[in-house]
Interface confidence: low
């Protein structure tokens, strides 16, 4: 009796230690991807950024993966996402190419399944970045909470890349699981 | 017999209700500082804000300790950082030392096993604020999820301090649990 | 004798899956709310932004309540808020009632109880948008953690509303629920 | 709530201190302004004190009042060298930025008579 | 300093009044506006020029930004006869009256 007591308690610790696994806190998905600035395309046009860290430094990866520049979502679920993009100039890097620049971020969801692309999130400033001072900074910070399915993709777009800060604190972006989906 | 299942059912119910206190979501800590107005220090030197609110308007904190102007981590796991800063300046204040003003945060870690700090985040602009203008103001916002282990702390600097504004809806930081470590 | 724990075990089951269910991610309260472009007032003062959308594209709301413009709060909790507004003028738009502009964004909390309105967070800049550029833009991002109760709303108010980007990426606001109050 | 007292009759150059009490709320958070208004007249902003502590005055009161506060729950209104153009109702007031003054006193009248 | 105007004004029952506030710098949203009755201290209408103080009926409104400001009553009615003041919160420095010189409404 006692014997089948305890196989009945085991069973349903077991069943509540499934549960709990699932619903762990650290069971959520995440990343904090910097940018990689050895590969920095050049130009002021707008471009798709591929080169990013996932595993050094700040930048760290959880039950999402990393590939061919995206960030490729495993988990259905509701995430937060955020990205922080710095553009410097210093006049000893030249002369720009134009003192009117457009400095601007859009964070992109790409879905497989059909084929399409759409921005989430976008942000960013003109700026007038005059030769009479020698340093020029800006940055954009943008955030928000999306449903995503396993399998999209989340990627960052910037004009002006040539003019990225290329530290690790200050051109990132990342995501993290909040909730599932109902 | 039944007595003896009330007692194994009672085993079972009480170390579920441990794993659960020890999972709810009210025991992840969190921190909402806003800046206190009365010790910011003056000129546009990059300086460590040490003067913050923890219990006041906005302001609190659960599970982390606020100490020496330093936010304390008590608890390892993985936190969203965050920090809005204002600035502004009004003729009334007087002149502007230069018109040409570099507008900065800077969100830090330090470690106190391993003495050392690094900046987490950084955010900011390059200003021209113009003697054409009587009042100028500039925010910025950054965000981020890392990796904080206990005793690990959190500051914040900014460059021209004497520009923040003292409105709590304007100069703060602030932190949130989102899972353990695995 | 085996009847009577099977009872008792379904007793156990039953308990704690009403406590999962409770505590469970998918039950915490969201939003995500994007401009609604149809209704953007004119002009360049101060104003609350009643028009958004809850149900179409990236918006979508759970366990909260979008009624008059603002956005309600259903469960007791803390929250991370976050709000992205964008602005823009291109000079076929006409000419801008002054090249000075204040672009600002608030956050603001209002309790029905106590009828009194509070400013949660604010952003925004001080542009000098001349006629020497044809088109000009800028973002504001904030975001912060607040203990939020439930009848309590949410809105927000920004100046120069007749330059707000109408893109759903571009100007939005949110909410979602991180842990219980203690 | 906010009160304020200690207003009378005095002779000019007289030193007078007033008083504002407050209770439900705290001068370790908020900042308290005083005010001031002559018979028939409008307001004047005196000047106000930060929860730090830190006194600040219209261009006009500077060397004439000095705000202080006392206690946890008072602050002072000190009234250097009065004269009769001082001779008005003081009203103590929580606030003074973007709330505005939230929270006022009834007023005590102070009158400066040789 | 404020500029408040008119000095006076005289509304009959059921009528709009407009009293007009210029700052002497740009102030942005940082004003308020008081209702104060004989012998009453005033009493906080509007603050960050637009927000309505708790308790106040919707009949009062605050626009502007920067340096020019309005208060508006729509539908007067006879307890509305008072002074109406606005007031700068945003700077203390330099400065002679964060008050402006009232404006006394008058219901017939």
């Known amino acids: 009796g006692s014997q089948h007591i305890r196989a009945e308690k085991a069973m349903v610790d077991g069943s509540w230690l499934d549960l709990a696994k699932r619903s762990k806190l650290e069971a959520q998905p995440f990343a904090h991807l910097t940018i990689n600035a050895t590969d920095i395309p050049s130009g002021s046009h707008k471009v798709s950024l591929s080169s990013w860290y996932h595993d050094r430094g700040w930048a760290k990866i959880s039950n999402m993966t990393f590939s061919n520049g995206k960030l490729i979502v495993n988990q259905d679920g509701f995430y937060y996402l955020y990205a922080n993009i710095c553009f410097r100039h210093h006049e000893t890097s030249g002369d720009l190419a134009t003192e009117y620049l457009q400095l601007m971020v859009y964070v992109t969801k790409t879905s497989i399944k059909i084929p399409s692309s759409h921005t989430l999130m976008k942000g960013g400033s003109t700026k007038y970045w005059s030769g009479n001072s020698e340093f020029h900074f800006y940055s954009i910070n943008v955030g928000g909470f999306f449903k995503l399915r396993s399998g999209e993709e989340i990627s960052i777009e910037v004009s002006n890349p040539s003019l990225l800060d290329p530290d690790q604190d200050a051109t990132y972006f990342g995501a993290f699981k909040v909730r599932d989906i109902d | 017999g039944s007595q003896h299942i009330r007692a194994e059912k009672a085993m079972v119910d009480g170390s579920w209700l441990d794993l659960a206190k020890r999972s709810k979501l009210e025991a992840q800590p969190f921190a909402h500082l806003t800046i206190n107005a009365t010790d910011i220090p003056s000129g546009s030197h990059k300086v460590s804000l040490s003067s913050w609110y923890h219990d006041r308007g906005w302001a609190k904190i659960s599970n982390m300790t606020f100490s020496n102007g330093k936010l304390i981590v008590n608890q390892d796991g993985f936190y969203y950082l965050y920090a809005n800063i204002c600035f502004r300046h009004h003729e009334t204040s007087g002149d502007l030392a230069t018109e040409y003003l570099q507008l900065m945060v800077y969100v830090t870690k330090t470690s106190i096993k391993i003495p050392s700090s690094h900046t987490l985040m950084k955010g900011g602009s390059t200003k021209y604020w113009s003697g054409n203008s009587e009042f100028h103001f500039y925010s910025i916002n950054v965000g981020g999820f890392f990796k904080l282990r206990s005793g690990e702390e959190i500051s914040i600097e900014v460059s021209n301090p004497s520009l923040l504004d003292p409105d709590q809806d304007a100069t703060y930081f602030g932190a949130f649990k989102v899972r353990d470590i695995d | 004798g085996s009847q009577h724990i099977r009872a008792e075990k379904a007793m156990v089951d039953g308990s704690w899956l009403d406590l999962a269910k409770r505590s469970k991610l998918e039950a915490q309260p969201f939003a995500h709310l994007t401009i609604n472009a149809t209704d953007i007032p004119s002009g360049s003062h101060k104003v609350s932004l009643s028009s958004w959308y809850h149900d179409r594209g990236w918006a979508k709301i759970s366990n909260m309540t979008f009624s008059n413009g603002k956005l309600i709060v259903n469960q007791d909790g803390f929250y991370y808020l976050y709000a992205n507004i964008c602005f823009r003028h291109h000079e076929t738009s006409g000419d801008l009632a002054t090249e000075y502009l204040q672009l600002m964004v608030y956050v603001t909390k209002t309790s029905i109880k106590i009828p009194s309105s509070h400013t949660l967070m604010k952003g925004g800049s001080t542009k000098y948008w001349s006629g020497n550029s044809e088109f000009h833009f800028y973002s504001i991002n904030v975001g912060g953690f607040f203990k939020l109760r439930s009848g309590e709303e949410i809105s927000i108010e920004v100046s120069n509303p007749s330059l707000l980007d109408p893109d759903q990426d571009a100007t939005y606001f949110g909410a979602f629920k991180v842990r219980d109050i203690d | 709530s906010v009160e304020e007292s200690g207003g009378r009759l005095v002779t000019p150059g007289t030193p007078l201190t007033l008083t504002c009490t407050v209770s439900g709320f705290s001068l370790s958070s908020d900042v308290m302004s005083w005010v001031r208004q002559a018979p028939g007249k409008g307001l004047d902003w005196i000047g106000y004190i930060w929860s730090g502590g830190r006194p600040y005055y219209a261009n006009w009161a500077k060397g004439r009042f000095t705000i202080s506060k006392s206690s946890s729950t008072t602050v002072d209104l000190k009234i250097t060298s009065p004269t009769t153009e001082d001779t008005a109702a003081y009203f103590c007031?929580?606030?003074?930025?973007?709330?505005?003054?939230?929270?006022w006193g009834p007023g005590t009248l102070v009158t400066v008579s040789l | 300093d404020m500029t408040q105007t008119p000095a006076s004004v005289e509304v009959a029952v059921g009528g709009t009044v407009t009293i007009k506030c210029q700052a002497s710098?740009?102030?942005?949203?940082?004003l308020a506006w008081y209702q104060q009755k004989p012998g009453q201290p005033p009493k906080l209408l509007i603050y960050?020029?637009?927000t309505l103080a708790s308790g106040v009926p919707s009949r009062f409104k605050g626009s502007g930004s920067g340096t020019q400001f309005t208060l508006t009553i729509s539908g007067v009615q006879c307890d509305d006869a008072a002074t109406y003041y606005c007031?700068?919160?945003?700077?203390?420095?330099?400065?002679?009256?964060?008050f402006g010189g009232g404006t006394e409404v008058v219901v017939k």
């Open positions: 710098q740009n102030i942005g949203y940082n």
């Open positions: 007031a929580r606030g003074f930025g973007s709330s505005g003054l939230n929270i």
């Open positions: 007031q700068q919160g945003y700077s203390v420095s330099n400065i002679d009256n964060a």
């Open positions: 960050g020029a637009s």
